[in-house]
Interface confidence: medium
């Protein structure tokens, strides 16, 4: 007879801490099953043999050491094999086994779908010792079951290197259909066929699918899950969903919008970010893409000038970033700029046109006829030049920049002078005697500094002797500047 019922934590109880609704085990003591006198743990176990019933599930002791008693085979008692319940219900199931008291340190572990359950608030093991055997009941409880609890649960026990395995307890959590694949939003070409997929599972099975378009059922007869709906084509946007039905009821998928691809809307808010003499940096806000990704954009540029031929320059660019630097423009010119973008369906209309201007350019030519001569009495160098013929786009001449480089043995230094636009001559002090002075001049406008003239060299002798002949830029056709002493 069972004289005592105990509930203890076994060595290594299976799960941590209590879950609401589960029993609390005492995790502080280690249990050794009572060792009853008269039994010696000297049992022999049958080897595994092909065809032998219960192999791996049953430990079959032969005899006790005294040889007088044959102990019954060790096996978990049969229990319920299949539990069907609804989601969010509680469930409790157990394994039980009677173990002779000669065995010590027995442990029952729970496994689900072939994987050991490494921890559980859910597991409790109770021991009912008698004179010769201890009945062990390992209970497993789950509060508010979910689909993830579906599976095959077994108990395992190790005794003398033999593994005893219980029959599986299959837990089937039933509920409303659960979608494993729902239709996805799509952007489709007008009047072109496309497919939508819907898949749902139980248990319980079967799961049947109805399709819904704009709140109306598409199919009169349900299709077994999974279902593929082929839509021959649409001319306008539609919303599709699917209904999944099983014996527990119905679940409706999310509604998905199927859009019809169209040409994009024109870009808006074309803005000027930066203007130079020959380039303009613009940005724009893309219009609606027409449910199809932008492929590229086109920047259209017209010169606003009564004398221009009215031709349009077109610059193609990627759709992103929404920015483009228009290059190769005339300085000090006015332009009208528009942007259009395209997707796979076609080009958008052009954005509203905006006006933009380039700034003054730098001069494109250097001053002419540069001559240099030494004025020894004043110890300076006279420089003369002719004003360059600049284009209107270069803007108004604001002055000249003179570079003079002084070179003597081991020394070289460059100095820069700025003179006003009304000048066509300048004087610079002699910096070094017995040296060469190299002079170059550039015209300056608000647009910048133009190119420097070809260098003109003059030798500055030591004090006391000098030739006053000038040095000048070469006549056209001469290869090098000349130095006249």
């Amino acid at each position: 007879a069972i004289t005592e019922a105990r509930e203890e934590a076994k060595p290594y109880p299976l799960f941590p801490g209590p879950l609401p609704g589960s029993l609390q085990t005492d995790h502080t003591s280690l249990l050794s099953l009572p060792h009853t006198s008269g039994y010696q743990p000297a049992l022999m176990f049958s080897p595994t043999q092909p065809g032998r019933p219960y192999t791996g599930n049953v430990a079959i002791p032969r005899v006790t050491s005294a040889g007088s008693k044959l102990l019954p085979p060790l096996a978990f008692k049969h229990t319920v094999g299949h539990i069907i319940l609804s989601e969010h219900k509680d469930v409790k199931f157990n394994c039980s086994i009677s173990v002779p008291n000669i065995y010590q340190d027995t442990t029952i572990s729970w496994w689900k779908d072939g994987k050991e359950l490494l921890g559980a608030h859910h597991a409790i093991t109770q021991f009912y010792p008698d004179d010769e055997v201890t009945a062990i009941i390992a209970s497993f409880s789950i509060t508010s079951v979910q689909r993830s609890d579906n599976g095959s649960y077994i108990c395992k026990m190790k005794i003398n290197n033999e593994e005893i395995v219980s029959d599986p307890i299959y837990i089937e959590v039933q509920g409303l259909p659960h979608f494993t694949k729902q239709p996805e939003s799509m952007n489709v070409t007008r009047n072109t066929a496309f497919n939508l997929t819907c898949q749902a599972v139980g248990p319980p099975e079967p799961v049947n699918i109805f399709w819904v378009q704009n709140s109306s059922r598409v199919n009169e007869q349900p299709e077994k899950s999974p279902s593929v709906l082929t839509v021959p084509g649409l001319t306008e946007m539609a919303v599709f969903s699917c209904e999944a039905h099983n014996d527990k009821g119905l679940t409706v998928s999310k509604g998905v919008q199927i859009n019809i691809k169209a040409i994009p809307s024109p870009p808006t808010e074309v803005s000027i970010h930066n203007s130079t003499a020959h380039s303009i940096l613009i940005s724009w806000v893309p219009g609606f893409d027409g449910y199809s990704p932008f492929r590229n954009c086109s920047v259209q540029v017209k010169e606003v000038d009564p004398l221009s031929n009215g031709s349009v320059m077109i610059f193609n660019t990627s759709a992103s970033p929404h920015m483009y630097q228009i290059k190769q423009l005339q300085a000090l010119a006015n332009y009208s700029i528009g942007v259009s973008c395209m997707n796979e369906i076609g080009w958008s209309a052009v954005s509203p046109w905006i006006l933009a201007s380039t700034t003054e350019g730098a001069p494109s030519v250097a001053p002419l006829n540069v001559t240099v001569f030494l004025n020894e009495s004043r110890d300076n160098v006279d420089i003369r030049w002719m004003k360059p013929l600049t284009k209107r786009q270069a803007g108004e001449l604001v002055g000249y920049r003179i570079s003079h480089v002084w070179q003597s043995a081991g020394i070289s230094k460059e100095l820069l002078e700025e003179v006003g636009q009304n000048n066509s001559r300048a004087q610079i002090s002699v910096q070094v005697h017995n040296a060469t002075c190299t002079v170059r001049i550039a015209a300056v406008t608000k647009g910048g500094v133009g190119p420097f003239s070809d260098p003109v060299k003059i030798f500055i002798p030591a004090h006391g002797w000098v030739d006053h002949a000038p040095s000048s830029t070469p006549a056209p056709g001469n290869a090098d500047p000349v130095l006249i002493i």
């Epitope: 934590a9 076994k10 060595p11 290594y12 109880p13 299976l14 799960f15 941590p16 801490g17 879950l19 085990t25 995790h27 280690l30 340190d105 027995t106 442990t107 572990s109 689900k112 994987k115 050991e116 359950l117 490494l118 921890g119 559980a120 608030h121 859910h122 597991a123 979910q146 993830s148 609890d149 190790k158 290197n161 593994e163």
Partner: antibody, heavy 124, light 107 residues
């Protein structure tokens, strides 16, 4: 004081073998599940396998990445856990830790005590 | 196998701030979740088990929460000793798996 000390790491060529040891002290070694975890340089921790306790026959479980190449065993008398690693690959390089499950395994399969680690480098 | 996804992968914070690290399981793991702290060049240390129970000796500024598939570790009033990497690990069933880690750095 509960203590785990790993040893046996070093440099080994791809395809080679290495055996790591973990000396345990300060607790009843036979009562605990014991595990090996590794950490490649600069990467996350990866569980390799464990050895169940005496009551569960010291049976073993392995991760898919090392199953068939690595073997976990114990010497209960000396309280040593072993990891025998064969057919090593470059991706097996890293720091190898041994750790124990808490004394009441049913308290959960987390790791309450860790060793200091030993470094394994697999390179030609 | 159950996948554990940790976020963010890295985080900068100042001493005294409060930070939260999250961990998501690919399926229901009830409360079978542990958190570990690992400092550079050191072995991991258990911080939290059963999703919210602090391990022995862990300061009360650490707290764990969550169950099912969503979990978080909160550190109040960050101290210099708290900087390092943090890992979550499930132990619902074999194989136990770790998250990819969160590196907590000083701002």
């Amino acid at each position: 004081e509960v203590k785990l000390v790993e040893s046996g790491g070093g440099l080994v060529q791809p395809g080679g073998s290495l055996s790591l040891s973990c000396a345990a002290s300060g607790f009843t070694f036979t009562d605990n599940y014991m595990t090996w975890v590794r950490q490649p340089p600069g990467k996350a921790l990866e569980w390799l396998g464990f050895s169940r306790n005496k009551a569960n026959g010291y049976t073993t479980e392995y991760s898919a990445s090392v199953k068939g190449r690595f073997t976990i065993s114990r010497d209960s008398s000396q309280s040593i856990l072993y990891l025998q690693m064969n057919a090593l690959r470059a991706e097996d390089s890293g720091t190898y830790y041994c750790a124990r499950f808490p004394p009441h395994y049913y308290a959960g399969g987390y790791f309450d005590v860790w060793g200091t680690g030993t470094t394994v480098t697999v390179s030609s | 196998d159950i996948q554990m996804t940790q976020s963010p992968a890295s985080l900068s914070a100042s001493v005294g701030e409060t930070v939260t690290i999250t961990c998501r399981a690919s399926e229901n793991i009830y409360s079978y979740l542990a958190w570990y702290q690992q400092k550079q060049g050191k072995s991991p240390q258990l911080l939290v088990y059963n999703a919210k129970t602090l391990a022995e000796g862990v300061p009360s500024r650490f707290s764990g929460s969550g169950s099912g598939t969503q979990f978080s570790l909160k550190i109040n009033s960050l101290q210099p000793a708290d900087f390092g990497s943090y890992y979550c690990q499930h132990y619902y069933r074999t194989p136990p798996t770790f998250g990819g880690g969160t590196k907590l750095e000083i701002k």
